[in-house]
Interface confidence: low
């Protein structure tokens, strides 16, 4: 059946999703809302104005915020079961050219596994072009470059992150499809570990080449808020983070990788029902600007600054933050106009400290993630082999050959 690359292009009614959780508190038009009560003890990314560093802290109940549907990086729209568009957003994997569809036999027959897949196109996630992702059996896609033990913590696209066990039933499959303009992962007839009697779940996440993300839900046999998170986090939404390499006090020549979640959209789990869908449309980010003039004159909700030495526009809060800091971009941009840079040679600079994206320990332990709110430890494993699925393996040699323990 022929592919359906154009699914979900039309506009629809406004969203009913309520976003919770991490937002950039210093640059966000969040509104206080006494009428909407969010979960207590949810994490909030805040700026430590004293030392200029970032830390995860917890908002007390009386400061709970509900963020409007414009989430700075994305606009989300909910389509309920009665909306025709919810059906249109479902990508018909059965219609795809068979060469573009893979039933991932390993993920379809195991529990708490993840496997790296290479996309046929650059997918812009929070403004970052990504070429490889990691599909997990637990109803989410890990979007990070570096595999670590806390996959479920951040850098995810999660239509329904939960303790799914595709190995429970022969009917359960994890299918993915890539036609060059859309990449779809479908968790098909998967069961919740320990809740098999509730029935099977069928849902999908679609990553469109233009940056749109669609969650479509076909079969959701139970109320999502009732799903237990004691063994595995239960989340629906998006998250991204940056990594900072810190000198390790124990081994001075090594650097410890710390992960900081800079943005999260958590969807109201009660809205996840059979035949509903949600579409995330990306908003412009600083990263898209390729010149100083465009950067400095941009009318975004972000405070965009131009770093001449990197020839990059940034708010300072994206995956390139390490470079932004290493090259002194934050200081360089202060009070300067584009004409100030015109006579400077941007090729001669060097960073304050040497930086390689694969410095440090790839199997980062939970203690080196400054995310205090995590309560459960997962034993999701990455399958580093291509096996019989024709999957390309782009893992660092350090991780090749043995499964890497991953976690919440």
């Amino acid at each position: 059946l022929s592919p359906q690359p154009g699914a979900g292009h039309d506009e629809g009614p406004g969203s009913g999703w309520a976003a919770k959780g991490t937002v950039r508190g210093w640059n966000r038009r969040a509104r206080e809302s006494p009428g909407h009560v969010s979960e207590p003890d949810r994490t909030q990314l805040s700026q430590d104005l004293g030392g200029g560093t970032l830390a995860m802290d917890t908002l007390p109940d009386n400061r709970t915020r509900v963020v409007e549907d414009n989430h700075s990086y994305y606009v989300s729209r909910l389509y309920g079961p009665s909306e025709p568009h919810s059906r249109e957003l479902w990508v018909d994997v059965a219609e795809a050219n068979r060469s573009q569809v893979k039933i991932h036999t390993i993920l379809s027959n195991t529990h708490r596994q993840a496997s790296r897949v290479v996309l046929s196109f650059d997918f812009p996630f929070y403004g970052h072009p990504l070429r490889q992702i990691t599909i997990a059996t637990g109803g989410f896609i890990f979007m990070g470059d570096v595999i670590h033990r806390m996959l479920t913590a951040t850098q995810y696209v999660a239509p329904l992150m939960a303790n799914f066990n595709p190995g429970y039933s022969d009917n359960s499959t994890v299918v993915y499809f890539d036609n060059g303009t859309v990449f779809v992962v479908q968790w098909d007839h998967v069961y919740l570990q320990g809740w098999e009697d509730k029935g099977s779940f069928t849902f999908q996440a679609a990553l469109h080449h233009d940056g749109r993300i669609v969650f479509a839900y076909k079969e959701i046999p139970m109320s999502v808020p009732e799903i237990s998170s004691s063994q595995h986090p239960v989340k629906t939404g998006l998250s991204d983070a940056f990594m900072i390499l810190n000198p390790s006090p124990d081994v001075p020549e090594s650097r410890r990788r710390s992960i900081f979640e800079y943005h999260r959209i958590e969807l109201d789990p009660s809205k996840v029902t059979s035949m509903s869908a949600v579409e995330f449309t990306p908003l412009p980010t600083c990263l898209q600007h390729r010149s100083c003039d465009a950067c400095m004159s941009s009318d975004l909700t972000f405070n965009c600054s131009w770093c001449h030495v990197l020839q990059r526009c940034s708010s300072g809060f994206d995956r390139y933050r390490q470079e932004w800091m290493d090259y002194g971009c934050a200081q360089e941009a202060e009070g300067r106009m584009c004409e100030d840079f015109q006579d400077e040679d941007h090729d001669s600079a060097s960073p304050d400290t040497s930086f390689s994206p694969y410095d440090g320990d790839l199997t980062t332990t939970s203690s080196s993630l400054f995310i205090d709110s995590l309560t459960t430890e997962d034993d999701t494993k990455l399958n580093p082999y291509a096996g019989g699925d024709g999957l390309q393996n782009n893992l660092s040699p350090k991780t090749k050959g043995t499964p890497v323990h991953l976690g919440t």
Epitope: R87, A94, K218
Partner: antibody
């Protein structure tokens, strides 16, 4: 209860036209794809055409391509099949079927059918 | 087009018998196979989708199995009301195609 009720069948001469209708009830019509499947007398089933929920996507069997047009009016919960340039081999009972176009594209509910006879 | 071939074309069995109908695809179709029952003078009814998933409301005596090119519909204990013609259908690629049908009669 899902119900599909076809109408519009009858006797028509070769080269003639006919428009079939299928009135749907018992489900949210606009959220489902719909299909036409036909069955010649004493023969098996043959898929004819499908249309997605919004009407934006249509598909046809080679045997009817260019002659038949599938359409829908979601405000009336009605599916249509406009049949032009009819041939003797188009004689069949025409069923409309609700189509689950998830992973397995199954026809999960069927109407009772309407007979189209093409004969001179 | 993918050809679907069913066998046998007809069979006769007694009430309580185990009945097996096979469907073969001209090329591998993974599990993209559905089964339908059509009683005399009636419209078809979906029994099994995705090769082995039982449609809601269908008696559990019906089951499906197989993947790739070879598929089986099994009626574990034939009942009088199972007198019908059974069709397989592939949804692996357009055009959607059906098998020629298997007529099941009661002895």
């Amino acid at each position: 209860e899902v119900q599909l009720l076809e109408s519009g069948g009858g006797l028509v001469q070769p080269g003639g036209s006919l428009r079939l209708s299928c009135a749907a009830s018992g489900f949210t019509f606009s959220t489902y794809a719909m299909s036409w499947v036909r069955q010649a007398p004493g023969k098996g089933l043959e898929w004819v055409s499908s249309i997605y929920g919004s009407g934006g996507k249509t598909y046809y069997a080679d045997s009817v391509k260019g002659r038949f047009t599938i359409s829908r009016d979601n405000s009336k919960n009605t599916l249509y099949l406009q049949m032009n340039s009819l041939r003797a081999e188009d004689t069949a009972v025409y069923y409309c079927a609700r189509t689950d176009y998830s992973l397995y594209y199954q026809f999960d509910y069927w109407g009772q059918g309407t007979l189209v006879t093409v004969s001179s | 087009d993918i050809q679907m071939t069913q066998s046998p074309s007809s069979l006769s069995a007694s009430v309580g018998d185990r009945v097996t109908i096979t469907c073969r695809a001209s090329q591998s179709i993974s599990r993209y196979l559905n089964w339908y029952q059509q009683k005399p003078g009636k419209a078809p009814k979906l029994l099994i989708y995705a090769a082995s998933s039982l449609q809601s409301g269908v008696p559990s005596r019906f089951s499906g199995s197989g993947s790739g090119t070879d598929f089986t519909l099994t009626i574990s204990s034939l009942q009088p009301e199972d007198l019908a013609t059974y069709y397989c259908q592939q949804s692996y690629s357009y055009p959607v195609t059906f098998g020629q049908g298997t007529k099941v009669e009661i002895k």
